[in-house]
Structure formats: C-alpha cells, structure tokens
C-alpha cells in the first residue's frame, strides 16, 4: 500500500491526532490534502516544523498561500522562522524574522496567541 492509499484509509481518524502522530505521518509520503490538514487540532499543528508540514502535505503545501488567512494555517505561519517559510516558494509573510529568539513561554502565548520574541 502506498502513502496515498494509506492516507485514504486513516483520513477519517485524523481529526484528533496529536503532534507525534502527525510527525510520524509526515514520514509516510501521504500527501495530505489541505482540507484535511485544516481540520486537524490547532495545538497539534502548531509545533510542526516547515519541513514536517512540507512532507505531510507534499504537493498540497502550495495551498497554504491560498488559505494563509485561516486557522490553523495563519497561526502556524506566525510560529515559523521567515527563512524556513521562504523555502516553500509561496511568498508567505508573517514568520519570525531572522535573528530573533523564540521564547516558549506557554502562559504568555496562551494569552496573546502568538509566541514571545526577543530581538537581536
């Protein structure tokens, strides 16, 4: 069974998948469609790296540009380094500028919805 066939079989169970499962799935060459990706738990999507999302979505990663205003895409973009976003070739803006440090202050983030940044 190839990655696409595997994805079709598990698609209906993905809504509540934790980050660890999504990371594992990104190694399976599943090419998850964007509609399914956007139904995933926001808290499970946010920790994924650009490389992991690229592997998870495959060719459908191109659609992040079209859906950049919607959650969880918007919130995920805000957590990524701009340098990393640039590798997607989509002109996505809003990532963390080069040279900034991301502080994982869970309380601060829970209140503001965005990570706390320290400038260079």
């Amino acid at each position: 069974m190839n990655g696409s066939e595997y994805f079709v079989k598990i698609q209906s169970f993905l809504g509540g998948a934790p980050t660890e499962d999504l990371k594992a799935l990104s190694q399976q060459n599943v090419s998850m469609d964007l509609a399914t990706f956007m139904k995933l738990r926001t808290d499970a999507v946010l920790p994924l790296t650009v490389a992991e999302v690229q592997k998870l979505l495959g060719p459908h990663v191109e659609g992040l540009k079209a859906e950049e205003r919607h959650r969880p895409v918007r919130d995920w973009i805000l957590r990524q380094r701009q340098d990393d976003l640039d590798t997607l070739g989509l002109g996505l803006q809003g990532g963390i500028p080069n040279g900034y440090l991301v502080l994982d202050l869970s309380m601060q983030e829970a209140l503001s919805g965005t990570p706390c940044l320290l400038g260079p």
Epitope: L34, A35, H60, E62, E67, D86, L88, G89
Partner: antibody
C-alpha cells in the same frame, strides 16, 4: 507584467526525450510554483505536475511519474520539463503555468511537441 | 483521482443571451474550515492558451468581465455568462485543485447561435 516565454516547437522520434523551457519575468520567480499542463490535438487539458522554484521540489502526476522530470534554474528564472521515452500519444502542446495559490493564474503560449517516426 | 464531468459538451447561444455550463466532481471540493471550494474555471479561445476566469468556485480573477460568474459548492458547480458576446466564443474548462493529480473537465465549447 507577468510573462512566460516557452521554447519553440520540437519534432521527436519515438523513444527520444524532449526538454521544454519556460522563462519567467515580471514577478519574483521563487514566490510562485510552476505547473505543467499538456493538451493533445483537439483534446482537453491534462495536469502533469508542479515544482517549487525555491527548493526545486517537484511533484508529478503518477501517469507520468517514470518519464517526467521538472527542474528550475533560479539564476535565469527558467523552469524546465523533460519527458522521456516519447511515444506518438505524447504529441501535444505543453504549457507552463504560474500558480496563483492553487489555480493556474498565468499560462505560457505553449510548445508543440510532435512525436513521429 | 477526482473525476470532473462537464455538461453540455457544446452550447450554441444567441448574442446577448445567457450561457450556463455545469461541472460535477466525483467528490467534494469544499474545505469545510475555510468554506473555500477548490474549483477554477478557464477560458481557451481558438489557437490560444487557457486563461483563468474564476477561482474558489466564485471569485472572479481581476480583469475578467462581470458577465462571467461562478457558483456552486461541494460537488456541483456552474459557470454563467450572463450576456454572451462575440469574443466569448471559446472552450471552457473547470479544474479541481483539491487533491493531486489536479484534473480538468472535458471542456464545453460555446458558439454563437
């Protein structure tokens, strides 16, 4: 103004390969994916695949998986599509098309590839 | 693969009259989170490259005359030309961009009656 300029018509023999180029201008080349679509004479449109010009990652329609290669040259803002093991059914106009998000916002003029013995 | 079925194959309409083209997909093209339908419409005039008219099923591309409109959701979509002009003679294609391989309908040829 966005412009996609494609290479000229080609005549190839069965079993040969063809490489079609698509030179882009009028926009930031690495910010938009490039797609390739073909159209056989008098027929409809068939999506062949797409490529991320920033990373060079490409994705192909499984129908062409073993025969197609898409590449980019960022220094010249040019995308390439190479199709190997040509057969008569590959006779078609091959279009490059710049993505607008997912949809195909700008199309090249097309390159006619004729496969004939 | 998602199958796109267009109807009719051809259509003859008088100048100034309405032309309606249908497109049906074999599975939903709706993103239920964003409420966007991943469907586009293209126009291809004789001897020319296709041109984008509509994306997200109903969003008109900039520069496209407002006589062109798209509607529908899920699996059933329609392209309407409210008042056909001579320059609208072309083949019209729908395309899904929900899941690869992105597939096109077979096309609808619009002519003047």
């Amino acid at each position: 103004e966005v412009q996609l300029v494609q290479s000229g018509a080609e005549v190839k023999k069965p079993g040969a390969s063809v490489k079609v180029s698509c030179k882009a201008s009028g926009y930031t080349f690495t910010n938009y994916w490039m797609h390739w679509v073909r159209q056989a004479p008098g027929q409809g449109l068939e999506w062949m695949g797409n490529i991320n010009p920033s990373s060079g990652d490409s994705y192909y329609n499984e129908r062409f998986m073993s025969r197609v290669t898409m590449t980019v040259d960022k220094s010249t803002s040019t995308a390439y599509m190479e199709l190997s093991s040509l057969r008569s059914e590959d006779t078609a106009v091959y279009y490059c098309a710049r993505s607008g998000g997912l949809w195909l916002a700008f199309w090249g003029p097309g390159t006619l590839v004729t496969v004939s013995s | 693969d998602i199958v796109m079925t267009q109807s009719p194959d051809s259509l003859a309409v008088s100048l100034g009259e309405r032309a309606t083209i249908n497109c049906k997909s074999s599975q939903t093209l709706l993103n239920s989170v964003s409420q966007n339908n991943y469907l586009a419409w293209y126009q291809q005039k004789p001897g020319q490259s296709p041109k984008l008219l509509i994306y997200f099923a109903s969003t008109r591309e900039s520069g496209v005359p407002d006589r062109f409109s798209g509607s529908g959701s899920g699996t059933d979509f329609t392209l309407t030309i409210s008042s056909l002009q001579a320059e609208d003679v072309a083949v019209y294609y729908c395309q899904q961009h929900y899941r690869t391989p992105y597939t096109f309908g077979g096309g609808t040829k619009v002519e003047i009656k």
